[in-house]
Every structure is written in structure tokens, then in C-alpha cells.
Amino acid sequence: STTKCTVSHEVADCSHLKLTQVPDDLPTNITVLNLTHNQLRRLPAANFTRYSQLTSLDVGFNTISKLEPELCQKLPMLKVLNLQHNELSQLSDKTFAFCTNLTELHLMSNSIQKIKNNPFVKQKNLITLDLSHNGLSSTKLGTQVQLENLQELLLSNNKIQALKSEELDIFANSSLKKLELSSNQIKEFSPGCFHAIGRLFGLFLNNVQLGPSLTEKLCLELANTSIRNLSLSNSQLSTTSNTTFLGLKWTNLTMLDLSYNNLNVVGNDSFAWLPQLEYFFLEYNNIQHLFSHSLHGLFNVRYLNLKRSFTKQSISLASLPKIDDFSFQWLKCLEHLNMEDNDIPGIKSNMFTGLINLKYLSLSNSFTSLRTLTNETFVSLAHSPLHILNLTKNKISKIESDAFSWLGHLEVLDLGLNEIGQELTGQEWRGLENIFEIYLSYNKYLQLTRNSFALVPSLQRLMLRRVALKNVDSSPSPFQPLRNLTILDLSNNNIANINDDMLEGLEKLEILDLQHNNLARLWKHANPGGPIYFLKGLSHLHILNLESNGFDEIPVEVFKDLFELKIIDLGLNNLNTLPASVFNNQVSLKSLNLQKNLITSVEKKVFGPAFRNLTELDMRFNPFDCTCESIAWFVNWINETHTNIPELSSHYLCNTPPHYHGFPVRLFDTSSCKDSAPFE
């Protein structure tokens, strides 16, 4: 092809090529043609004769102002036609007359201000019609019943001011899953407007200034329709009362989106008419008081999003939002509750009472004063089968005994990014009989004891990153009870002292993060009593991160038990010479990181076993000694391996001898070196 299109598997991509005409030299069997972001003004039908197999044609982002009706005659199999972001202003009855197999027609962002006659009458198979971002002033798309298979009608960002039954009755035989009318200036819903549509399942009126009064009228118009999904995000619905959604009593609404409404007052029984509702979005509002009956009637809601729904009006404590006890008691089917990023004063004794199916609860950054978790804090969740609890970013400073004793089903507990500073007696976790993961990273300080985790032997993941960990060198190890542990993160703790039995018995451990500590002394031969072999017995370890520990020595047998090790990160240390056979048992190694060390020599006797099955190697920024003895084997291996070595050309540079300083390692000439073959 003389054009620069890329063709693969019957798909031709000719986008962003500044084309002024359709290429005439593409394979004739292409089924998908992308001509977006070019300079096409027209689409001569004749140019498509050779591409009769096309099922999808995308000519978006051009300057097409007119369509030849014959285009679809040449493309009898066309199913998807995308004309978005062009300059179409008129659609005649002939425009799409031959496009009878279309399932998708995208006309978004053109200049279509009015639809005359019936340009879509032949589109009996059309499923999606996108007319958003045009200048349409009404929903009138024709004068006779048509588009019986249409499922999505997208009319957002137009200038529609009223919905009228006489304009929508062309959809009398349609079942619309989605009627998208967001970002219009709708002021009127004429009687019967939605009943004119055969069946309407989804209505989206986001960014429409409805307010409480027009919302109420809308809901009355939706009475006795098939509506399932209703989205009224950012519709200036500042208050709701027991009449706002009254009309929805005669529907089976399952999804309601009231997000971004600056909703201030949620009156009692506002949602009493929605017993079928399952998904309720209330995020980004401004509810000042949730009354005990505000959510009454929502017996079937499974998902409720209250993120940033309760925010304080001023710095005054008196202006803090209030949630009455028992406010959630009606939500018997609720499984997922998101209450992130709120300004709720605290957890009251019956705040969550009645949530007998709750499995996921996010309380991240939810409270203004949740400094201490007591044995009463979560009492209202005692009858909830909670599996996941997120308590991050709440400035929690202390966890008292039995704080979670009510949560016997809990599997994941996230306490990260708080200010917890205490000795962990182990009582904090009492009752967590099914716990799988505890995330404690990014807290103030944690002092461990032999019993810190004695009561949670089921724990499989423990995250203790950057918690100023104290007493980790006690014996027995604080981790001794955790025989099911698969992931342990102890990184960023400046740990300098650990015993050889710290990880003893953790035979299921797969991931161990010890980066950013101060473990260098432990592997020195001069260490009193010799090197500390704290990795012994970890026969199922897959990932080991020891980056940034100041290591300048590695004992020869330190990795000998790690038969299943796949990834090891020893980057940002001070390693120079590694003992021969140090990696002999790492037959499964896939990724090795030794970047930013002081390695000068890469010899077969040290690295041969490690490199054998490697898929990724990172040894950037090491001061390589470019001599035959030091790197000849390495250079030959580099030039023959399929291992991915990022930035090989730019960051693997010789440091010595002086005449090679700054020279790329891979270009080192090994032809004069003897016995440097990488593979035998």
C-alpha cells in the first residue's frame, strides 16, 4: 500500500494520516476501515466499490458535509457507520436509504439542527442511534412509526426543551434500553410523552435543571412505564419529600442515580415508592440530616453509594451532618455501602443496625472524630455478614480490645493511612475468625508482641509497610502463629535487627516485601555470630523484594531454600561481588533486579543459573568493568538472549577501564576474548 495505513486481520487503520481521499489500494477483503482524524470532505461511493466486505466504517473527525446515498449500496454488509465530528447538517430520506443492515449509526457532534421527514425509516436493524452534540431542538426524528429494533437513542447535549408524545410516538414499537437526554434544557414533560414509546427501560437526564418540582412531574409521567434505570445526576434536586418520586410507585425501577445534586434535605419516606430499587447512587451531595425514615422503603437495594454525600457546611462543629440511629434499618438486602469522604461526626450505637446482608462497607475518610475504635464502635454491625471493611484515612490513633469482635465474617480489614500508634496485644483482632487480610500500612508506630497475631491464624495477607515497626526481633516471632500467611509486607520500616526465626513456619509465604529497611549488617560475615539466614525454609516464596537495604554482602547459601522464587529485587544496594552459586537453586527465576548496585563483573559462575530462564533483567546503572574477564560472557549472553532488558543501550555503560568509560556494554567486542560463549 502506498498509503501508510496499517492492516491486520482484515482491519485497516488509516487514522491520523491527513488523507484527503479514501485510499484505493487496501486489501479488498478488509471488514473494518478506520479513516478517523483525516481531512476527508466527502465519501465518493465509487471509492468503496472494492471494499464491499466492510462491516464497520469509521470516518469520524473529518469535514464531511454530505453523504452520497449510493455509499451503502456499495457496502451491503455495513453494520456500523460512524460519522461523528463532521459537518453534516441535512439528512434526507435518501441519505441512509440503502443502509438497511446498520446496527449502529453515530452522528454525534455534527450540525444537525432538525430532522425532516424520515431519514431513518429503513434502519429496521438499528440498535444504536447517536445524535448527541448536535443542535436539535426537539426529539422529532420522523413522522411515522419506525426503528422498531432501536435500543439506544442518544440525544444528549442538544437544545431539546420539551418531551412530547407526538414526537416520540415513532418509537411505539421500540424497546429502548437507553434514552439519553442529558445536558438539554428540558422544561416540560407533556402528558403521555413516555407512554408513546413502546417500552422504555432506561432514561438519562443528567445535567438537566429539573429541580424538585419538575422531577416530581417527570416521575408521574413515568408511572406505568417499563422504566428500570433512571439517572438524574446534577439535576438541581436540592430536596426530596414523600411526593418527589411518588409516580415511580407504579414502576419496577431498579437503578436510580441522584449523584451531584447538592441534595440537602432527604425527607422521611422520600423513597418509600421504590421497593424494587437495587442500585442507588447518592454520591456527591450535601445531606445535612439523614432521618430515621429517609431511606424507608428501600427493601431491595443491594448497592448504595453515599460517597461525599455528608459534608460539613462550615468549620463549626454544629454544622456537622447528622445520621439518625436506625437510618439504614430498612435496607435489608444491602450488600455494598460506600460512605467514603464524608464529614460524619462518629459511629453511633445503632448507626448500621438492620443491615443483615451487608458484605462490603467503605468508611474511608468518613469521620471527623473516630480517633479510637472501641468494643462498642461496630456493635451495630453485629448482625451483618460483613466481608470487607475499609477504614483508611480516618486519623484513627488507637484500636482497643475487641474492636472488631462483632465482625466474625470479616475477611478483609483495611486500617491503612491512619495514625495508629500502639502496642498490638492481639486483642484488637479478637473475633476475626475468618480474616484473610489485614492492611495496616502507613500508620504512626506498631509495637509487636508474641501474641500480636495469635488470635488470627487464618490470616493470609498482612501489610505492615511504613509503620515504624518495633519488636520485630522478639522471639518467638510475632508472626509465628500465621502459618497460612502468603503475603507479608514489612517494607519501609528501617528494620535493622531481625532473628533467623522471624519468618519461621511461614511455609506458605509467597510474597515478602522487605525493601527500604536497614538489613545490611545481617548478611555480613563479620556480623557477631555470623550472617542471619532469615529466609530459610521459605520454599514457596515467589517474590522477594530486598531493595534499598544497604547490602554490600550476600552469604552464599542465603537463597538456598527459595526453590520457587520467580522475582527477586536487590536493586539500590551496595553489592559488588556476589559469591559463586548464590543463585544455584533459583531455577524458576523470571525477573532479577540488581539496578544501582556496584557490580563490575557479570560472570557465568555467579549469574549463569539465575539467567537461565529469565524473562526480565534490570542491571542498569552499575559500574561495569569492560574487560574480557569481567563481562565477555555477559555481553555474549545479552546478544543471544530473548530476555527483556530495558534501556540496554543507554543505561548499561562501561565504567572501567578508562578508555571504555561511558561506552555501551552491549557493543563491547568479545571476539578477542576466549571461552566467553554464553550457552554451551
Partner: antibody
């Protein structure tokens, strides 16, 4: 099943030493710490110390620290408790015990070894 | 060291009686308390751990309660095989001390 079998009764003179053994079976010996507890006639049980069979690390009760030595032989799956400078008040039944999956309890005990100190 | 004090030291009761034995620690041991039953010439047998969790194979007539410093062992309806000596033991920090024992005898 987990079993701890101790050596037989001993009679010792004051000032002598005694070494009691505890052979473990039914589990991997190096996986769980072994504890030693004694009980003088009509007296309460007394915790003496614990050993990590894997590396030999020991924690002693300060009361016995100068006289007790706890060791292990991993090849024989056996722990030992040696008490020196015996006095008549050391006459007691000496037990070895092992923690369970829950490390805050002793579900497993040896049958006990009676050590009699008498001149 | 944490001292453990049991009361009463001895107790006479009849089959079918409800019996309560208490154990007090000289410091906070949280819930790291075990109860054992010992019969003459035998090793102690674990009944309850972590203050209230019943050990495997132990009849449900045994129950434990308490936290911090004060703990209770209750036998709801005494059976003939329950006449023995009962000990509490803490597991908070070494040394793991025992109570002096409570001897339960037939009235």
C-alpha cells in the same frame, strides 16, 4: 496424632543434675516451640522455659535461669531439660508441652517425668 | 511477673450442681488465659483457651468468661468425671504462670 513421650522417673542426690528427654512425633518437630513445666507435690504448675527446636533459641523463667538448660536434637525429634544443683524442693513431676495452632495454649503434654531428689 | 490467684482453693459439690471457679491476674493479661483439668498422676488436660474458647472434645457444660484481670470457669452441671483439680494459666508474657489450683471434691 501429636505425641510427646518423656523419659522415665529419676532419683537424684542433692547437688546432682538430671536430664529429662521429650520425644515428639506426629508433626514436624522443628515447627513448634517446646515448653517445660514442673509440678512439685501438692503445688501449682510452674513454667520453666521454652525452646525453638529449629534454631535452639531459648527463653527461660528467671527463677530457673542459672540452673536449667534446655536443648534439642532435631535429628532425634527430641527436646531435653537439664536441671543442675538439685535440691529437695526440686522433687517434682516435669512435663514437656507444646502449643497448638492457637499459640496461646498447651493442648499437648508429655506424660510427665517424676524426679525425686533425696539424700 | 504476673501472679495468678484462684479461688476457692477447694470446693465440695454434688453431681448436677453448677460450679464456678475464679482466677485473678495481678496485671492485665487481656484474654490470654487457659483452663486445665488435672487428675492425680496425669498430665493437665486443656479445657478452655483465650478465656472462653472450648478446646476440641471438651463437653459444652464447661464455659469460660472474663477479660483483663478477672476470669471465671463454669461447669453448668457437674458430672462424676469432673471431680479433679483445675488450674488457670496466662499466656500474655513470660513467665507463663499458673494459678495455685482449685480442688473440686464430691460433697
Amino acid at each position: 496424632q501429636v505425641q510427646l513421650v518423656q523419659s522415665g522417673a529419676e532419683v537424684k542426690k542433692p547437688g546432682a543434675s538430671v536430664k529429662v528427654s521429650c520425644k515428639a512425633s506426629g508433626y514436624t518437630f522443628t515447627t513448634y516451640w517446646i515448653h517445660w513445666v514442673r509440678q512439685a507435690p501438692g503445688q501449682r504448675l510452674e513454667w520453666m522455659g521454652e525452646i525453638n527446636p529449629n534454631n535452639g533459641r531459648i527463653n527461660y523463667n528467671e527463677k530457673f535461669k542459672t540452673r536449667v538448660t534446655i536443648t534439642r536434637d532435631t535429628s532425634a525429634s527430641t527436646a531435653y531439660m537439664e536441671l543442675s544443683s538439685l535440691r529437695s524442693e526440686d522433687t517434682a513431676v516435669y512435663y514437656c508441652a507444646r502449643v497448638g495452632v492457637m499459640i496461646t495454649t498447651f493442648p499437648y503434654w508429655g506424660q510427665g517425668t517424676l524426679v525425686t531428689v533425696s539424700s | 511477673d504476673i501472679q495468678m490467684t484462684q479461688s476457692p482453693s477447694s470446693l465440695s459439690a454434688s453431681v448436677g450442681d453448677r460450679v464456678t471457679i475464679t482466677c485473678r491476674a495481678s496485671g492485665n493479661i487481656h484474654n490470654y488465659l487457659a483452663w486445665y483439668q488435672q487428675k492425680p498422676g496425669k498430665a493437665p488436660k486443656l479445657l478452655i483457651y483465650n478465656a472462653k474458647t472450648l478446646a476440641d472434645g471438651v463437653p459444652s457444660r464447661f464455659s469460660g468468661s472474663g477479660s483483663g484481670t478477672d476470669f471465671t470457669l463454669t461447669i453448668s452441671s457437674l458430672q462424676p468425671e469432673d471431680f479433679a483439680t483445675y488450674y488457670c494459666q496466662h499466656f500474655w508474657s513470660t513467665p507463663f504462670t499458673f494459678g495455685q489450683g482449685t480442688k473440686l471434691e464430691i460433697k
